[in-house]
Interface confidence: low
Amino acid sequence: MMTGTIETTGNISAEKGGSIILQCHLSSTTAQVTQVNWEQQDQLLAICNADLGWHISPSFKDRVAPGPGLGLTLQSLTVNDTGEYFCIYHTYPDGTYTGRIFLEVLESSVAEHGARFQIP
């Protein structure tokens, strides 16, 4: 039985040319996370494997950076980056959990960043 839940940064916006952090959080389960995939619609952006570490898809290596944690940093944003992003948690024994984030890249400087980092 899958008891876990995925929390995400939700719907977020950022300025064209800027950067944004995509983040998901799997909670309420003791299942072991074996791999996290980050996908944009049907394209694979990155994989973080528990044993092998990070792999960034070659076509995104210039604009996608790993972390922090299991998150993903997108930089040099363009309007074409607007759309849905998915974090896919592969776990044992639960199976697969998927979280959705919608990113809107704005031309103006009024973008509100959804992911804010506080000093610990």
Epitope: L26, S27, C48, A50, G53, P68, G69
Partner: nanobody
Framework: EVQLVESGGGLVQPGGSLRLSCAAS??????MGWFRQAPGKEREWVAS???????WYADSVKGRFTISADNSKNTAYLQMNSLKPEDTAVYYC???????????WGQGTLVTVSS
């Protein structure tokens, strides 16, 4: 327990250089990275490095900053050249702390660029 300890910050004149270090203990990491936070602003990503050596940089520091890692020492470095006043911030080291939400931050090291 994972510990991240940054060092190397300080006061430097515009155009000058600094080298930050982040020593990690407690486990082996897939990647290490640097973020920074200027007063009154959000924490922003600066650079990341994988253990395999691949590096990434924010556009604002490309060509001026170089991130590297010494895997044998579990230490990451950030060489900062041609520093500008807008680089003034507290610089934080981070890494992947296993496979959960609670990644680790260091305590930060202050970099001040001023004449």
């Amino acid at each position: 327990e994972v510990q991240l300890v940054e060092s190397g910050g300080g006061l430097v004149q515009p155009g000058g250089s600094l080298r930050l270090s982040c020593a990690a203990s407690g486990r082996t990491f897939s990647f290490m990275g640097w973020f920074r936070q200027a007063p009154g602003k959000e924490r922003e990503w600066v650079a990341s490095v994988l253990r395999g050596g691949y590096t990434w940089y924010a556009d604002s520091v490309k060509g001026r900053f170089t991130i590297s890692a010494d895997n044998s020492k579990n230490t990451a470095y950030l060489q900062m050249n041609s520093l500008k006043p807008e680089d003034t911030a507290v610089y934080y080291c981070t890494t992947d702390r296993g496979y959960n939400w609670n990644y680790d931050w260091g305590q930060g090291t202050l970099v001040t660029v001023s004449s």
